[in-house]
């Protein structure tokens, strides 16, 4: 079996984290986050070959049925593994806050 | 905000938990796996357009800047929120045994 | 290297007001957050509150509202802490610490002892 | 607000040992703890966020792990350097909370 990690596809094509810089009102947070004005997102971004970063078992069939019937079955997809928490300071309805959100950076990547 | 189960694209068309029948051939399993020799393979598939079954706040950063983006940044991906375990009949190298895999069949779905 | 310099010690009357400085350099002032922590002797860390340094909005533990206020001077990459109404509940060490959206309190300055003492 | 609990205030430890400084959270924080050392007269030093990344830096001797409730800290290959207190501190909700501190000393 090929490496898990090792992209045949060429460096960088492959599912990984990547860091997209973006500002509040990119975000559609302007009406509500106050600080930080920009943040930069880590997201999941590539492409999903055979054997490449699969999260499990599903992930294997899914793919083995992608290459059966292309049209029904989508190849996998790069998603994140893990998040890392993210501070924000926001309004409310009182006044400020510190918020501090779970679900919101990806802090590493696999295929479902 | 729309109703995050209403897909806008028409009925089916959005992510949700589909069957695919699958042989032990068709899943690569045919020189370990004894039984079942056919599989209702759950999983999710379908468009996850602005809103709909959003997984989390990533969820939706990742359809903002999709739409700032599209080249860069792709849409959210439909993947199992949850999975039902499966029990196979396999071979080992004592005989055979009973083995349940929690992480094969989708049990529901959303967008990441 | 990122450096936070306060003073060592500071010693003031029951009653009376404080105001403690956290010096930065070693990076963009404007583009973390300032947190400040409480420490009394042989205790535990408590944390009193944060400020945005580019936009001074504040955020404070409850306990401290009223009793902290947290401003910044960005001309001189400075924060401030005024403590007001001080009694001797309020000797302790106090540290600035740097703080990010992700990185929490990831450099910290060697702290103000104050005394509150007649 | 959110209680952290070091139950062992001191733990005991010799140079080249493994040891877990355990950390335990009134309610559920997710990954957001962080975990600090600090020595007699030093302003505390950032090892671990978000539960288990280190801080540039950091000697990959210390390894920070859990979710949830419980959270470790664990010193493999202890070195004398180390011997100091060690604080976990929550930052999932407001106010942030820290743990009492558990002092890592020679046997």
């Known amino acids: 079996a090929r490496n898990g990690d090792r992209c045949p596809l060429g460096p960088g094509r492959c599912c990984r984290l990547h860091t997209v810089h973006a500002s509040l009102e990119d975000l559609g947070w302007a009406d509500w986050v106050l600080s930080p004005r920009e943040v930069q997102v880590t997201m999941c971004i590539g492409a999903c070959p055979s054997q490449f970063r699969e999260a499990n078992m599903h992930a294997q069939i899914k793919m083995n049925l992608h290459r059966l019937k292309p049209d029904t079955v989508p190849a996998p997809c790069c998603v994140p593994a893990s998040y890392n928490p993210m501070v924000l300071i926001q309004k409310t309805d009182t006044g400020v806050s510190l918020q501090t959100y779970d679900d919101l950076l990806a802090k590493d990547c696999h295929c479902v | 905000a729309r109703n995050g189960d209403r897909c806008p694209l028409g009925p089916g068309r959005c992510c949700r938990l589909h069957t695919v029948h699958a042989s032990l051939e068709d899943l690569g399993w045919a020189d370990w796996v004894l039984s079942p020799r056919e599989v209702q393979v759950t999983m999710c598939i379908g468009a996850c357009p602005s809103q709909f079954r959003e997984a989390n706040m990533h969820a939706q950063i990742k359809m903002n800047l999709h739409r700032l983006k599209p080249d860069t940044v792709p849409a959210p991906c439909c993947v199992p929120a949850s999975y039902n375990p499966m029990v196979l009949i396999q071979k080992t190298d004592t005989g055979v045994s009973l083995q349940t895999y929690d992480d094969l069949l989708a049990k529901d779905c959303h967008c990441v | 290297q990122v450096q936070l310099q306060q003073p060592g010690a500071e010693l003031v009357m029951p009653g009376a007001s404080v105001k403690m400085s956290c010096k930065a350099s070693?990076?963009?002032?404007?583009?973390?957050?300032m947190h400040w922590v409480k420490q009394r002797p042989g205790q535990g860390l408590e944390w009193i509150g944060v400020?945005?340094?580019?936009?001074?909005?504040?955020s404070y533990n409850q306990k401290f509202k009223g009793k902290a206020t947290l401003t910044v001077d960005e001309s001189s990459s400075t924060a401030y802490m005024q403590l007001s109404s001080l009694t001797s509940e309020d000797s302790a060490v106090y540290f600035c610490?740097?703080?990010?959206?992700?990185?929490?309190?990831?450099?910290w300055g060697q702290g103000t002892t104050l005394t509150v003492s007649s | 607000d959110i209680v952290m609990t070091q139950s062992q205030k001191f733990m005991s430890t010799s140079v080249g040992d493994r040891v877990s400084v355990t950390c335990k959270a009134s309610?559920?924080?997710?990954?957001?703890v962080a975990w600090y050392q600090k020595k007699p007269g030093q302003s505390p030093k950032a090892l671990i966020y978000?539960?288990?990344t280190r801080y540039t830096g950091v000697p990959d001797r210390f390894t920070g792990s859990g979710s949830g409730t419980d959270f470790t800290l664990t010193i493999s290959n202890v070195q004398s350097e180390d011997l100091a207190e060690y604080f976990c501190?929550?930052?999932?909700?407001?106010?942030?909370?820290f743990g009492g501190g558990t002092k890592l000393e020679l046997k």
């Open positions: 610490a740097r703080g990010g959206t992700t990185v929490v309190l990831d450099y």
């Open positions: 309610q559920n924080v997710g990954t957001a």
């Open positions: 400020i945005d340094t580019s936009e001074s909005y504040t």
């Open positions: 070693g990076y963009t002032f404007t583009d973390y957050w």
């Open positions: 978000s539960a288990s």
């Open positions: 501190q929550q930052y999932s909700s407001s106010p942030w909370t």
